[in-house]
Amino acid sequence: APVNGSKWTYFGPDGENSWSKKYPSCGGLLQSPIDLHSDILQYDASLTPLEFQGYNLSANKQFLLTNNGHSVKLNLPSDMHIQGLQSRYSATQLHLHWGNPNDPHGSEHTVSGQHFAAELHIVHYNSDLYPDASTASNKSEGLAVLAVLIEMGSFNPSYDKIFSHLQHVKYKGQEAFVPGFNIEELLPERTAEYYRYRGSLTTPPCNPTVLWTVFRNPVQISQEQLLALETALYCTHMDDPSPREMINNFRQVQKFDERLVYTSFSQVQVCTAAGLS
C-alpha cells in the first residue's frame, strides 16, 4: 500500500520518477518493463506452449470496460485461465499502454531498444493459492501477465471489439459494457514463441510478483485504430476543469542487471523471399 495517498501519473510531479516515494516497491527489485536484447536471452527447452482455456467469451455475456484514469481496462471472468504454468492462473482484466499521435511508440517492453506502437497486458492471478487478484497481487507467484506487442499495420477486427466502445469511457470513472468475444484473437501468431522472466507490475504499487510472458511476435492494428486509442480518452473526470489526455501511459524500461530472460524459441528469425522462417 502507498505511504501517502494513491495519486500517480505518467507525467509531471507525480510521474514515474516519483513513484517510489509513495510506493517503495517501484524503486526496488525485479522491476518491469525491460528491454529484451540478445545478451540477456537464454533458450529454455522446458518453456512449453501455454494453453488458453475459457478465452472464448460468449457475446450473451457482458464485460465491464473501465477508464481508470491510467488506462482502459476490460474485466475478465474468473473461469478464463492459463494452463501450463506451475499453478492455475485465472484471468482478472486486460488493459493497454500506448504513446501519442506525434510519437506512436508506447509499448512498455522494448526489443533490442525499439518500442512497439502499443502493448496489451492480460492479467491473471494464481487461483490455486489465492481467492482473488487483489489478494494475489503482493504475494510470491501471485500474478502472471501475458504481454502482446502491437505494431501499426492492417486493421484488426478483434481489437476493434474493444476500441469501438472507447467513446463510452472517455473520462475517468466511466464504464461501459462490452459483449464477450474470443480473447485468444487478441494474441499473435505462434504463441508458443515467447520471452519469460520474473518481474513486477508496471504501475504502482509495482509489486515484484509477476511472471511475465511476452509473446515474440507482434499483432497489428491500423493507423486509424491506434489513433483512436491515442486520442479517445482522458485521465481526468468529465467535470474536471483541467482535462488531461490519456497518452504516453507507459513506464520506461527498468534496469535488468545480472539476470536472464528465458525464451521458448532458439532460432533467429531470418527474412527470406518466402517470408519468415
Epitope: S58, A59, N60, K61, Q62, L64, P77, S78, D79, Q167, H168, Q174, E175, A176, F177, P179
Partner: antibody, heavy 121, light 106 residues
C-alpha cells in the same frame, strides 16, 4: 419454454434484510447472465446488479454496492439477491431478467413475474 | 450515469391516433431499447436496437433515432397498446431506464 420465477418477497422491518430467489428453467442456465431489476410503486425501473451463473462473477450498480449481494446455486438453476439495511425506499417489485445478444448489444428478452418487497414497521 | 428523460410522462390519445414518445439520453448512446409494461405485469421487450421489433410486436410500432434522441411511434393506436413504455440504454454502466411514458385512453 424459457421461464424465470422469483420468490421470497414480503414484509420486512426497516434495517432488516431480504433474500430473494430467481429460479430459471427452459434454457442452458450458465449461458446467460441473470440481472436483478426493481420497480418502486408507481416508479420506473432500476437495475441492481447481475451475476454470471457460470462462475459466480458479479457486477453491481454502484448505488447498491455494499448493500446488495447476488449469488447463484448452479445445481438448482437459481440466483439470489440479498439486500441488507433495508429502508422504506427499498419497497419495490423485484424482477430477475435475462439479457440476450442480438448482434450489437443485448436486450432483456425474458422477465420473471416479480416479487413484492414491502419495507415497513 | 446516463440519465434517460422520456416525454411526455403521460399522454391521452384515442384509438387510431398516431402517438410519438421521445427518449433523450444525457450522453450519446449506441442503441435504445423499449419495453412495454401493463399494470401488475412484468415489462416485455418491445423494440430493441433502436428500430427492431421484438417477437410478436405489431408493425404499427416503429423506433428511430441516434445519438441522444430516440422515438417510439405508434402509427395507429389500438386498444391493446394502452400501457407504459420504458426506454433503456446499455452503452454505459450503470444501464439505465427512462421514467416511463403512460399511454392512456382519452
Amino acid at each position: 419454454e424459457v421461464q424465470l420465477v422469483e420468490s421470497g418477497g414480503g414484509l420486512v422491518q426497516p434495517g432488516g434484510s431480504l433474500r430473494l430467489s430467481c429460479a430459471a428453467s427452459g434454457y442452458s442456465y450458465t449461458d446467460y447472465n441473470i440481472y436483478w431489476v426493481r420497480q418502486a410503486p408507481g416508479k420506473g425501473l432500476e437495475w441492481v446488479g447481475y451475476i454470471d451463473p457460470a462462475n459466480g462473477d458479479t457486477t453491481y450498480n454502484q448505488k447498491f454496492k455494499g448493500r446488495a449481494t447476488i449469488s447463484v446455486d448452479k445445481s438448482k438453476n437459481t440466483a439470489y439477491l440479498q439486500m441488507n439495511s433495508l429502508r422504506a425506499e427499498d419497497t419495490a417489485v423485484y424482477y430477475c431478467s435475462r439479457p440476450i445478444y442480438y448482434g450489437a448489444y443485448w436486450y432483456f428478452d425474458v422477465w420473471g413475474q416479480g416479487t413484492l418487497v414491502t419495507v415497513s414497521s | 450515469d446516463i440519465q434517460m428523460t422520456q416525454s411526455p410522462s403521460s399522454l391521452s390519445a384515442s384509438v387510431g391516433d398516431r402517438v410519438t414518445i421521445t427518449c433523450r439520453a444525457s450522453s450519446p448512446v449506441t442503441y435504445m431499447h423499449w419495453y412495454q409494461q401493463k399494470p401488475g405485469k412484468a415489462p416485455r421487450p418491445w423494440i430493441y436496437a433502436t428500430s427492431s421489433l421484438a417477437s410478436g410486436v405489431p408493425s404499427r410500432f416503429s423506433g428511430s433515432g441516434s445519438g441522444t434522441d430516440f422515438t417510439l411511434t405508434i402509427s395507429s393506436l389500438q386498444p391493446e397498446d394502452f400501457a407504459t413504455y420504458y426506454c433503456q440504454q446499455w452503452s454505459s454502466n450503470p444501464l439505465t431506464f427512462g421514467q416511463g411514458t403512460k399511454v392512456e385512453i382519452k
